[in-house]
Amino acid sequence: AVITGACDKDSQCGGGMCCAVSIWVKSIRICTPMGKLGDSCHPLTRKVPFFGRRMHHTCPCLPGLACLRTSFNRFICLAQK
């Protein structure tokens, strides 16, 4: 597994990570940590593992956290109720 750096699919990344689009270069995917408490997220980001190529630059939230709306267009990882 690639612990950090370029990837193509989730299976190439270590635990607690996903293969997300780089925020600097859209054509590159990098192993990215899953969302921690308070991190920005998107509720439709594919769960881990995803067997295709992601389009989002964020990973889903860590287990035990959910991607919840805090305002009209803002979602963050919060503890599941």
Epitope: F50, F51, R53, R54, M55, H56
Partner: antibody
Amino acid sequence: EVQLVQSGAEVKKPGASVKVSCKASGYSFTDYDMHWVRQAPGQGLEWIGYISCYAGATTYNQKFKGRVTITVDKSTSTAYLELSSLRSEDTAVYYCARDGNYGEAYAMDYWGQGTLVTVSS
Amino acid sequence: DIVMTQSPDSLAVSLGERATINCKASQSVDYDGDSYMNWYQQKPGQPPKLLIYAASNLESGVPDRFSGSGSGTDFTLTISSLQAEDVAVYYCQQINEDPFTFGQGTKVEIK
């Protein structure tokens, strides 16, 4: 060749439940999510929900929450849609459709032939 | 829910001419520079068929006379040169917010 083969037409009474099956072949079943969509006679398309065939996690259209259950049997590569408390407005063709794995663009690239569910007293 | 409104409801075009279908979302379906909009074709008695995903990406095996464009709330499906086999109903679908919602459909016929 990817194929999704659905179960046959059903006629149900109001208040009853129906369970529609969708048997997949020609690809690795657990690598792709499965959606369910319905189409009332002469009407447009309505998304019901989808399931991760790998993990079994589901996302439902809130309109159907509490009445719909989507499940998979990995051993037979089959997805199921169960809809309870049927009413006449549920009369429709129900389709299963494979997600194409195009990242977060949840696009349905292969569809079953459809199952007509008629709800009538 | 995001409401998708297609125009026109129906369209009659001569063979070989251009057909244009519009789809307007009640709010933006963009995220992080991508547009989360798909287009499907449905012929009578058949299930829908995916044509375009993520606004402008042509599905494998779909003729290149089909193209998609747009961003934000306004999207277009174009058939550059209408063929007899393109007679169908076309649907847009947003996939940026749950529940995924479809437009009401646009019927394309031969003039």
